[in-house]
Interface confidence: low
């Protein structure tokens, strides 16, 4: 029996379309596939940022694949041809690996890139990013922000910079249509008369950096002689009620009584007849059903009840 062999794919390359980290991996079929005309050849593709411990693995019949990468680091990828066992009357046959790498030649020393980049998607409506200038850069240094997400034809530059002492230190983004639940890519590069400035690349998803508005319309309602229901309303804006978690802080007679996290806009509190004052505040955050992370809102305005006999009142403010 002659051993069945297959060649690796040809012309394997990583192509940068200018989307700030979203790259194309592409290849051509291997040479000498004539023996396997009746067979569907598959390809096993492995890729990662250089320095990552784990490879991402894709098995595909196509001649291309797209994914996002961290352009602050290099990228390495390898691919081989797979002949399924149905093609070989036996076990699966694999070619040797074809390998390729990609990286952006860095300009400037690392210290010149922006520091403390921070992006917040306020109330799932307004994206704002801010940064500090690189260490030791001169006042003539200016930074420019570019962004891209799937749906844009090309990367766009910020048009509304936040400035300090003439330098760009942030960006107010325009309305970003259909931009959540997908990778959002940012590059901040810079220019200076005196020395080259290192670019920085960032990737995140907007729903994971949402800071909601605080809840509103806080009220008390007597439920029974020893129970009070605290209620509030979701903040105004596009975030649906099902997306919120809440944290409540309740103070009874100037001592912290309860801190609780709840999923609904109500909380029932057990009280004693001796209670003279009850205050609570609430803040909101996007929950795990709508995002993987989030930022707590500011605390709501405090709502208090003060009186002689809390147990006999209906408390509506």
């Amino acid at each position: 029996d002659t051993e069945i062999k297959v060649n690796p794919p040809q012309d394997f390359e990583i192509v940068d379309p200018g989307y700030l980290g979203y790259l194309y991996l592409q290849w051509q079929p291997p040479l000498s596939l004539d023996h396997f005309k009746e067979c569907t050849v598959e390809y096993e593709l492995k890729y990662r940022n250089i320095g990552s411990e784990t490879w991402k693995t894709i098995i595909t019949k196509n001649l291309h694949y797209k994914d996002g990468f961290d352009l602050n680091k290099g990228i390495e990828a390898k691919i081989h041809t797979l002949l399924p066992w149905q093609c070989t009357n036996g076990s699966e046959v694999q070619s040797s690996w074809a390998e390729t790498t990609y990286w952006i030649s860095p300009q400037g020393i690392p210290e010149t890139k922006v520091q403390d980049m921070d992006c917040v998607y306020y109330n799932w409506q307004y994206l704002l990013c801010s940064w500090k200038p690189g260490i030791g850069v001169l006042l003539d240094t200016n930074y420019n922000l570019f962004y891209w997400y799937e749906g844009l034809d090309h990367a766009l530059q910020c048009v509304d910079y936040i400035k300090a002492d003439g330098q760009n230190i942030g960006c107010r983004f325009p309305y970003l249509e259909a931009s959540d639940y997908k990778d959002f890519y940012i590059c901040v590069n810079g220019s200076s008369e005196n020395k080259p400035i290192r670019s920085s690349y960032f990737t995140f998803q907007l729903q994971n950096i949402v800071k909601p508005l605080p809840p509103v319309y806080l009220t008390f309602t007597r439920e029974s002689s020893c129970e009070i229901k605290l209620k509030w309303s979701i903040p105004l804006g596009p975030i649906p009620a099902r997306c919120f978690d809440y944290e409540i802080e309740i103070r009874e007679d100037d001592t912290t009584l309860v801190t609780a996290t709840v999923e609904n806009e109500t909380y029932t509190l057990k009280t004693t007849n001796e209670t003279r004052q009850l205050c609570f505040v609430v803040r909101s955050k996007v929950n795990i059903y709508c995002s993987d992370d989030g930022i707590w809102s500011e605390w709501s305005d405090k709502q208090c009840w003060e009186g002689e006999d809390l147990s006999k009142k209906t408390l509506l403010r």
Partner: nanobody, 128 residues
Amino acid sequence: DVQLVESGGGLVQPGGSLRLSCEASGFASDDYIIGWFRQAPGKEREGVSCISSRYANTVYTDSVKGRFRISRGTAKNTVYLQMSALKPEDTAVYYCAMDSRRVTCPEISTMHRNFDSWGQGTQVTVSS
């Protein structure tokens, strides 16, 4: 309605390999996670592995690390579980499941709480 169809199960000798496939249909979202679970006779269902559609981040239960590999097809609606160095204790019905509310895989110990659509299962038997 979401439909999940598993295939690729069968009888295999200890040390052997199998590749399970899970094909998902009937959903609109690009963002979801797919997990593989297994249930041996008389035992509770346990999470084996998970992959997310958006990030391709993966998690595995300790007993299969280094032996099983989860991956997705290009169309993203097919997920594979490549199982190698199989042991008799891997014998079970293997189920795939989807959670369309999440975009990254949770810790394997909490995985069973997160899935809202399930397949019918495929039997894997490891025996000499």
